[in-house]
Amino acid sequence: TLNSVLNSNAIKNLPPPLGGAAGHPGSAVSAAPGILYPGGNKYQTIDNYQPYPCAEDEECGTDEYCASPTRGGDAGVQICLACRKRRKRCMRHAMCCPGNYCKNGICVSSDQNNFRGEIEETITESFGNDHSTLDGYSRRTTLSSKMYHSKGQEGSVCLRSSDCATGLCCARHFWSKICKPVLKEGQVCTKHRRKGSHGLEIFQRCYCGEGLSCRIQKDHHQASNSSRLHTCQRH
């Protein structure tokens, strides 16, 4: 089981997470709570930043949190603000950028409590044994060579989204990574939540399709945190 993997320290010095091309700003998946994968549906530059009204951190993008734009401002007016980088002041985990968490009022790297390393080792140990070797980014030849001549169909194993056919992305599922359908309008999606206290989630959903973003369902604003539902909605 995965628990035994959590105790393994066999794999060190990992490359970027499997499934995201090196240097790409975001992974191809809508990662679930606790996973330190950058990426999501709302990568925005400061230039074209549009304030997005919010009530909860979960309504904001991966690299944002929900707060009043002015210190001591009207608590009723909140927007999605850019996350705080390492060593910046914070009041809660969600204020810190992915890969960091709030400790004693300061955003610190998740590396410092071994959280990131533990997760990455777990993923590679349990999902990666059949995947890539860790020197450079070269692949072991255990994957069927056929896979790379024809694009992977739904459910077939993959290393990254480019291995999958059109309309599919490469995402974690059970102990492996497989080609899954890109999400359509109305389908449930996962918002990244950077709270380090969350357990390791080993299911990933693809991102929302073109013209869609992952937003909280309007009728779920009053729902409890645990049942808050996000779906792919038109921009």
Epitope: T1, L2, N3, A32, S126, N129, D130, T142, L143, S144, K146, M147, G152, Q153, E154, G155, S156, V157, H173, F174, W175, S176, I178, K180, Q187, V188, T190, G199, L200, E201, I202, F203, R205, S226
Partner: antibody, heavy 116, light 111 residues
Framework: QVQLVESGGGLVQPGGSLRLSCAAS????????MSWVRQAPGKGLEWVSG????????HYADSVKGRFTISRDNSKNTLYLQMNSLRAEDTAVYYC?????????WGQGTLVTVSS | DIALTQPASVSGSPGQSITISCTGT?????????VSWYQQHPGKAPKLMIH???NRPSGVSNRFSGSKSGNTASLTISGLQAEDEADYYC??????????FGGGTKLTVLG
């Protein structure tokens, strides 16, 4: 179309061994994880074991750990389950299932009866 | 053992809607936010009906829908038909025991 056909079931005495096979066709077998799931007569489903597409990664339910071994031969498109030290409670229909988006295709199953 | 709890039986008349519940613990249904549903007719192999809580594989009727709230997942079948009579199993994945199946629910279509 995807097809999974199990074989190798039968009557065996407690403590005995049996090897189940599952012949796969209609898809690229070597690109999918595979699983065995069993169902005791009149009971619910119980996941038994899973194996990665190359065979280098295996998982087992606690109830069969150390007694059952899952393996595969990608050149023959065949999945196997070697069952040793069989017990009466292992009596069940054993299904082979493809692990795509969950257990998305199942065989019709083969009955294993452990009785003296 | 971690278990998913389903009602032993549910019944409904043709055309009606029925819902089958599946209750788990925070480490499975609630924690992982991932549930699948399988249909099994007597003497037949199970068939995947819903994955990821609410997604239907191709070929599955849109009369079948899934949802989840907290630690309870639900399968709803609308416009009940005679051929829907079968056993239904929910399933999730747990970090300590891998796959977990519910005990199953026998659906009877009356009349």
């Amino acid at each position: 179309q995807v097809q999974l056909v199990e074989s190798g079931g039968g009557l065996v005495q407690p403590g005995g061994s049996l090897r189940l096979s599952c012949a796969a066709s209609g898809f690229t077998f070597s690109s999918y994880w595979m699983s065995w799931v069993r169902q005791a007569p009149g009971k619910g489903l119980e996941w038994v074991s899973g194996i990665s597409y190359s065979g280098s990664n295996t998982h087992y339910a606690d109830s069969v750990k150390g007694r059952f071994t899952i393996s595969r031969d990608n050149s023959k498109n065949t999945l196997y389950l070697q069952m040793n030290s069989l017990r009466a409670e292992d009596t069940a229909v054993y299904y082979c299932a493809r692990m795509g988006i969950d257990l998305d295709y199942w065989g019709q199953g083969t009955l294993v009866t452990v009785s003296s | 053992d971690i278990a998913l709890t389903q009602p032993a039986s549910v019944s409904g008349s043709p055309g009606q809607s029925i819902t089958i519940s599946c209750t788990g613990t925070s480490s499975d249904v609630g924690g992982f936010n991932y549930v699948s549903w399988y249909q099994q007719h007597p003497g037949k192999a199970p068939k995947l009906m819903i994955h990821d809580g609410s997604n239907r594989p191709s070929g599955v009727s849109n009369r079948f829908s899934g949802s989840k709230s907290g630690n309870t997942a639900s399968l709803t079948i609308s416009g009940l038909q005679a051929e829907d009579e079968a056993d239904y199993y929910c399933s999730t994945w747990d970090m300590t025991v891998d796959f977990v199946f519910g005990g199953g629910t026998k659906l009877t279509v009356l009349g």
